[in-house]
Amino acid sequence: DYKDDDESRTETQPPVTNLSVSVENLCTVIWTWNPPEGASSNCSLWYFSHFGDKQDKKIAPETRRSIEVPLNERICLQVGSQCSTNESEKPSILVEKCISPPEGDPESAVTELQCIWHNLSYMKCSWLPGRNTSPDTNYTLYYWHRSLEKIHQCENIFREGQYFGCSFDLTKVKDSSFEQHSVQIMVKDNAGKIKPSFNIVPLTSRVKPDPPHIKNLSFHNDDLYVQWENPQNFISRCLFYEVEVNNSQTETHNVFYVQEAKCENPEFERNVENTSCFMVPGVLPDTLNTVRIRVKTNKLCYEDDKLWSNWSQEMSIGKKRNST
């Protein structure tokens, strides 16, 4: 398919040839092409390309271009050749190649397909059935990421209310670039009756830490010392804690944001691996104080900033006064 720009051209190169498109993994779309036939001998060929909506313009010498994209809608690439990296130079006539999503009734595709990476150890995806789907549909979720050699099928399909879901192991590897990548997801049915749905989950988003575990509460003068175990797998710069203290007598509800803190006071059990400590000032020891803690990722480590962990189990200290 040729796309001619309406502006007049001078000395433009011939169009590229054999533009083709293919899909690797689940959501890696790759276009390849051959150099134009009869290009000027004094021309150092560069290729201008952009997607159908004129997004992501690129000028590069390679005869391929790839994009990671959920194949839920048609995507087109237009490619032209030119003799320099100058964006103002007119490229050749643009050649376009499109790829369409798998066939099927759009109303049959699952909706609200989303995934959460729990404690950097497993990923849990959930979805709602499409409108045109039979209630006994058996779903299959496939996933792929860079550290896998091939596409894997998720085995642990479950149902929670209206939602279906599946979870699979996904452990952060030491390779520092691991989290710069994404997990590609596809949900379809075993019988091939529904239109497949795709999603791409960046590993820098949708991270939910495990809740902390409170180990110890103790009073020293009018200060309450709280000691807890941090969730595993995270580095200290990537988490912060919300400590909530409720007092039964005053019915006050105090919330403190806490950086991961060393246990340096004598009141704390020292040098315990992976524990944090915090001193809550001005707490009445002769009243009942209930503490719970939750944790959240830092936006500088993980982009999605809406997910707190669940609350820890509550722990109380002090005594409830008798009401007279």
């Epitope: 912060f240 919300e242 959240k296 500088l300 900033d305």
Partner: antibody
């Protein structure tokens, strides 16, 4: 008491290099981020970037990426902001800040005024 | 990139009056990360509010913060003479352009 003490005012010519410093005290220097904020004359605040001295992990605002370098020496609890080639438009007050993981800037240095003029 | 827009640009009030400053985010943000600062001429800014509503250490209780999603508010219940200054909201790498609170 948490303190961030910055190096003194600088007057430079365009094209020159510069490295300003910020020394932290009164807290665990390796457990908090240190950031830099620019304020041009009569203007608002601009977030330049941060470093986590514990492992020297840095993040830059897109506007400052490649324009400046943020570094830290945890052995002397000091963070640095440097330019390899100053421009007149770099004339501003530069503040170093301490940042906990929830992103607020809870302690500020006194500021370093950088003037770049031929 | 998230853009924070503060309004009004300038607020002219008398001591003892209530000041309401607005900060609107271009997309929904977590209130955990929203902070407010005060800056007086010739001084470094100082943190007033973090986590949208928690007062920083030593900040008088006439300062309060509220809001969630895209709309956040800083309220000064009764303006004292020392409160006339410029106020900024911030979320990580983004600052609002500032609201100047001046004496009427």
């Amino acid at each position: 008491e948490v303190q961030l003490v910055q190096s003194g005012a600088e007057v430079k010519k365009p094209g020159e290099s510069l490295k300003i410093s910020c020394k932290g005290s009164g807290y665990s220097f390796t457990s908090y981020w240190i950031g830099w904020v620019r304020q041009m004359p009569g203007k608002g605040l601009e977030w330049m970037g941060v470093i986590y001295p514990g492992d020297s992990y840095t993040r830059y605002s897109p506007s400052f990426q490649g324009q400046v370098t943020i570094s830290a020496d945890k052995s002397i609890s000091t963070a640095y902001l440097q330019w390899s080639s100053l421009k007149a438009s770099d004339t501003a007050m530069y503040y170093c800040v301490r940042m906990p993981n929830w992103g607020s800037l809870d302690h500020w240095g006194q500021g370093t005024l950088v003037t770049v003029s031929s | 990139e998230i853009v924070l827009t503060q309004s009004p640009g300038t607020l002219s009030l008398s001591p003892g009056e209530r000041a309401t400053l607005s900060c609107r985010a271009s997309q929904s943000i977590s209130s955990s990360y929203l902070a407010w600062y005060q800056q007086k001429p010739g001084q470094a800014p100082r943190l007033l509010i973090y986590g949208a509503s928690s007062r920083a250490t030593g900040i008088p209780d006439r300062f309060s913060g509220s809001g969630s999603g895209t709309d956040f508010t800083l309220t000064i219940s009764r303006l004292e003479p020392e409160d006339f200054a410029v106020y900024y909201c911030q979320q990580y790498a983004s600052f609002g352009q500032g609201t100047k609170v001046e004496i009427k």
